[in-house]
Amino acid sequence: APVLPGEDSKDVAAPHSQPLTSSERIDKHIRYILDGISALRKETCNRSNMCESSKEALAENNLNLPKMAEKDGCFQSGFNEDTCLVKIITGLLEFEVYLEYLQNRFESSEEQARAVQMSTKVLIQFLQKKAKNLDAITTPEPTTNASLLTKLQAQNQWLQDMTTHLILRSFKEFLQSSLRALRQM
């Protein structure tokens, strides 16, 4: 935040900061969630051997996790700010049900799983503010989400471990792509 004339509240050597711009706030928030995902992945990898499974084996799943594609306009070639922003918000909204699923999947990192879920809600809010004039954002149906959640929770232990690992890996990749794209906006 700027200093009022005649005020000085900073370290003498430090340049003064402005209030965070919306982009900086979003950037910090994504870093926060990514750090949370790292902590959750660490617990998952310590608990099961999913992290050693080949990408091909893990790809053989019926989870419809959001993923960035060329048409979404988030990559450097064919970058389109509006299309990309819609994709990021829509993708995060779709991830919410999977983050809800993660809530009972951790023991020592329970608080972090909650923090990742909560922070994703905040991130969506920040992004929706940035995308005020975009109306192409579709919210997943609550009933669809509820039945998907029930289905995921009914899986056997091995499949639940795999699902947890896949969600975390996909969410990390989605956020990293989002972070790169948002830095171009």
């Epitope: 935040a1 700027p2 200093v3 009022l4 005020e7 509240s9 900073k10 370290d11 430090a14 340049p15 003064h16 900061s17 209030p19 965070l20 706030r25 910090k28 928030h29 870093r31 926060y32 969630i33 750090d35 949370g36 790292s38 902590a39 972090q112 923090a115 905040v122 503010k129």
Partner: antibody, heavy 115, light 107 residues
Framework: YPQLVESGGGLVQPGGSLRLSCEAS???????MSWVRQAPGKGLEWVGS????????YYNTKFIDRFTISRDNSKNTLYLQMNSLRAEDTAVYYC?????????WGQGTLVTVSS | AIQMTQSPSSLSASVGDRVTITCQAS??????LAWYQQKPGKAPKLLIY???DRYPEVPSRFSGSGSHEDYTLTISSLQPEDFATYYC?????????FGQGTKLEIK
């Protein structure tokens, strides 16, 4: 476990020093952090903040000569070094994540300055 | 430093009442203002940021409004768990400053 846990509070004599710690979960590694204090029965007062790498620190002018904020990211810990303590520094000290507004807070640690 | 004048300093109300707390800054804030709720012995909890954005999972009965120097927190229908102290905070300028608080008590 809670995401932010302050410690190091206690009874100290006027003129004494104290170092408060705020142990943070790994999520706070890339975040600006602030210290905020609250005297018994009084309102909230911002002490200062620090950027993720610890390069830039911002202080409330009131504390710039006596208080120093630092962090050790390898230990995921934020510190508040308080020197030349006075009776009016008696307060609960909170650490919080700083997005300009504070969206995550520790539970606080009580510092009592008294002879 | 920016002065934040919160009013009233205390307020008695009943469950179901509509309550308004105001915060006046000594300088233009560009909506860079937050509202917090604090219960005895607990840390403050963020309710509203950027003047009127409700933090996720904060009940919809809480709303923020205002511009320039004048801001308002409204609780549309008081619930038993809302009896607490409320603070505004400006983050337009450093040092960040808080209002002196409004203690909301049961009538």
């Amino acid at each position: 476990y809670p995401q932010l846990v302050e410690s190091g509070g206690g009874l100290v004599q006027p003129g004494g020093s104290l170092r408060l710690s705020c142990e943070a979960s790994v999520l706070f590694k890339h975040q600006d952090m602030s210290w905020v204090r609250q005297a018994p029965g009084k309102g909230l007062e911002w002490v200062g903040s620090i950027d993720p790498r610890g390069d830039h620190k911002y202080y409330n002018t009131k504390f710039i000569d006596r208080f120093t904020i630092s962090r050790d990211n390898s230990k995921n810990t934020l510190y508040l070094q308080m020197n030349s303590l006075r009776a009016e520094d008696t307060a609960v000290y909170y650490c919080a994540r700083d997005l300009d507004f504070m969206d995550e807070w520790g539970q606080g640690t009580l510092v009592t300055v008294s002879s | 430093a920016i002065q934040m004048t919160q009013s009233p300093s205390s307020l008695s109300a009943s469950v179901g009442d509509r309550v308004t707390i105001t915060c006046q800054a000594s300088y233009w804030l560009n909506s860079e203002l937050a509202w917090y709720q604090q219960k005895p012995g607990k840390a403050p909890k963020l309710l509203i940021y950027d003047g009127d954005d409700r933090y996720p999972e904060v009940p919809s009965r809480f709303s923020g409004s205002g511009s320039h120097e004048d801001y308002t927190l409204t609780i549309s229908s008081l619930q038993p768990e809302d009896f607490a102290t409320y603070y505004c905070q400006q983050y337009r300028y450093t040092p960040y400053t808080f209002g002196q608080g409004t203690k909301l008590e049961i009538k």
